[in-house]
Each structure stands twice: as C-alpha cells, then as structure tokens.
Interface confidence: low
C-alpha cells in the first residue's frame, strides 16, 4: 500500500512556502506583538514574602540582547513581622524563552536558536523535609 | 539595532545589526530541557500562593505547548493551611519569545512572536488605599 499523501491542512505544506535550504529554517526577527507590555501588580518583587532582585544580562551576539534574570533575596520567607522565617523557603520560578544566537567563524556568520531558562521571580514554599532513619 | 564587534579583517558587507531575516539551523540549542513545569518541580502545590497549570496548545507555534499558571486563591495559605485574605496571591508574568509559522502551515519558515505568560504565583502584602 502506498504511503498516504497528507490531506489535512494541519500537516500540509502549502505551495507558497518559501524555499529553504535543508537543515535550516527562515526566521523573521521582526517581532509580532513587540510593543506588548507586562501588566504585573506594582512592585511585587519587593512586596512578596519571597522578594527578589533583578539583574540584566547583556550580550551583543544574542537577540534580544538584554535578558532580565531574577534572584531571590533570601533563603527563607518574610513573615508578618518583616523578619526572615527560615522554616519556609524562597524558591525561583523559571520559564524557558527562545533567543537567536549569532556565531562568528572567521568572517562568516551563522545563526542558531537557543532555549534560555529565565528566572522570573520567586515564591514561598513549604520545604520538603527528609527524615534520616 | 545591536552593534557588535567585528573582525577588522572581514569584508565590510556585514551589517553590524541583526538582519531582519536570518537563516537558522533547525537544531535548537538546549532543546531537550524539560518544558513541563508539572514534571520539573512541585512548587505550584507547595507554594503559599499555589497555582494550577493550564496547557495552551497551538500547532502553528514553537513550542506548540505552553503552560499557563492561574493562582488558586485571592489570598495566601497560612501556617494552618487556611487562606489568609490579608495577603494576596498574584501571578508572576513574563514576556517570552516563541516561533510563529509564517506563512501559516509552512514547515520551515517562522517569525518571532512575543507572548505574555503567567509562570507562577507569589504571595504579596496588599497595597491598601485609605479613603480620606
């Protein structure tokens, strides 16, 4: 029996697709929704019971060049009295994003997609306690 | 655009900024990192501002599956395991870049797209507005 030709558009490669060399893909880095902005509650990094600081990493051979990373300020969490409670833990929350990496080999330039893990903020969790027998 | 240092011995044709369209290797570096937050940690259950994870699937996007966090409570869980409404559970949002098939359904042609995702929740002291 012949292998079926895909009939559903979900799998179909339209005739209008741009020609792409084998092993690579065409990527337009003009970002859709470029002007979208985060609408988080104000100053949550300072008001959180697991507060964090932000640092910006900058790399001219990465697109986007700036990536913001969060770091938890404390090991424990801040209690109602404003003191650190080490019976609880501040832990980082992470999210993957894509970046485009530019690589120079001699005078030629190539581009590579890369998954980057970004620490977005912190949350306060009950610790997992391991009891030693 | 982004200015980059360049080997001075190279011909001058290369744009210092990222070009609008680039040809990219199909292999994604660090592609095999675990993308399912339910499997990578149980913080969503152990947090004082716990959240549920909802699967958002779009075959015209890479990655095709993205997990969205929704805070379970308005308040936070206190030491007794009850919801304390003197504190607020709020989502932590992040802009991430994904690939969008463009034109649609084309296997190897994409455009970068910025999307806003809620990654998890954190417990904050509320901003109290006093009415004069």
């Amino acid at each position: 029996r012949k292998i079926p030709k895909v009939g559903h558009t979900f799998f179909q490669k339209p005739e209008s697709c741009p020609p792409v060399p084998g092993g690579s893909m065409k990527l337009d880095i003009g970002i859709i929704n470029e002007n979208q902005r985060v609408s988080m509650s104000r100053n949550i990094e300072s008001r959180s019971t697991s507060p964090w600081n932000y640092t910006v990493t900058w790399d001219p051979n990465r697109y986007p060049s700036e990536v913001v990373q969060a770091q938890c300020r404390n090991l424990g969490c801040i209690n109602a009295q404003g003191k650190e409670d080490i019976s609880m833990n501040s832990v980082p929350i992470q999210q993957e994003t894509l970046v485009v990496r530019r690589k120079h080999q001699g005078c030629s330039v190539s581009f590579q997609l890369e998954k980057v893990l970004v620490t977005v903020g912190c949350t306060c969790v009950t610790p997992v306690i391991h009891h030693v027998q | 655009g982004i200015t980059i240092p360049r080997n001075p011995g190279c011909p001058n044709s290369e744009d210092k900024n990222f070009p609008r369209t680039v040809m990219v290797n199909l292999n994604i570096h660090n592609r095999n990192t675990n993308t399912n937050p339910k499997r990578s940690s149980d913080y969503y259950n152990r947090s004082t501002s716990p959240w549920n994870l909802h699967r958002n699937e779009d075959p015209e996007r890479y990655p095709s599956v993205i997990w969205e966090a929704k805070c379970r409570h308005l308040g936070c869980i206190n030491a007794d395991g009850n919801v304390d409404y003197h504190m607020n559970s709020v989502p932590i949002q992040q802009e991430i870049l994904v690939l969008r098939r463009e034109p649609p359904h084309c296997p190897n042609s994409f455009r970068l797209e910025k999307i806003l995702v809620s990654v998890g929740c954190t417990c904050v002291t509320p901003i109290v507005h006093h009415v004069a």
Partner: nanobody, 119 residues
C-alpha cells in the same frame, strides 16, 4: 535507511483494547518526537498523539484523550499506543511517524496497521 514498522492492529469489539507497536531503525530514535496518526476509510489524515524525544511530554487529540496512551522505549527504539475503550469511529489505518526537529511535519511514515472496531 529510515524504517518504521507498525504492528498490533486487528479486529476488536467496541469497548475493547489494543496495543500498537512501532519498531524504528535507521535514525537516532531518541532525538526525535514521534507521532501516531490515523486515516479512517475515505477520510483525511488525523493526528492522534505525539510524544517528545525523551518521553517527558505527551499530547493527544481531543477525540482520544483519556482513552489512548502513547509511550516509547528509546533503548528498544520502539513507540507504542495503548488504546482502551475503543469505539467504532476509531476504525482506521494507524501510522507511526517520525517528526522533524520542529513539530507537526512528518518526514517518514510507517506502512500502517489496520484497527477495526466492530461488533
């Protein structure tokens, strides 16, 4: 040469179960997402399930969610589909497919195995 060979199809009554297998060779099996797709008589192709290369994530079409389970054994270079609570509308030729690096476009197919659900 890339080869995908499905097995395990057959005639089963509504409500019954079947387990399909797909033996892969000729490529680095553990580097690719793998799919099950099906084609019912006289119909187009329907995506059934996908599993990531390391088995960490599984995705299902709404029509099979909760009834079918996709799994893989990278050491044996094998893909599986456990089908429970089968219905007449699950009757189709089932194909396993090797995904491209980016999802949902298949560069290799198996020859298919026929599943018939009938009383």
């Amino acid at each position: 040469e890339v080869q995908l060979v499905e097995s395990g199809g057959g005639l089963v009554q509504p409500g019954g179960s079947l387990r399909l297998s797909c033996a892969a060779s000729g490529f680095t099996f553990s580097s690719y997402g793998m799919y099950w797709v099906r084609q019912a008589p006289g119909k187009g192709l329907e995506w059934v399930a996908k599993i990531e290369q390391d088995g960490s994530e599984e995705y299902y079409a709404d029509s099979v969610k909760g009834r079918f389970t996709i799994s893989r054994d990278n050491a044996k270079k094998s893909l599986y589909l456990q089908m429970n609570s089968l219905r007449a509308e699950d009757t189709a030729v089932y194909y396993c497919a090797k995904g491209e690096i980016l999802p949902l476009y298949f560069d290799y197919w198996g020859q298919g195995t026929l599943v018939t659900v009938s009383s």
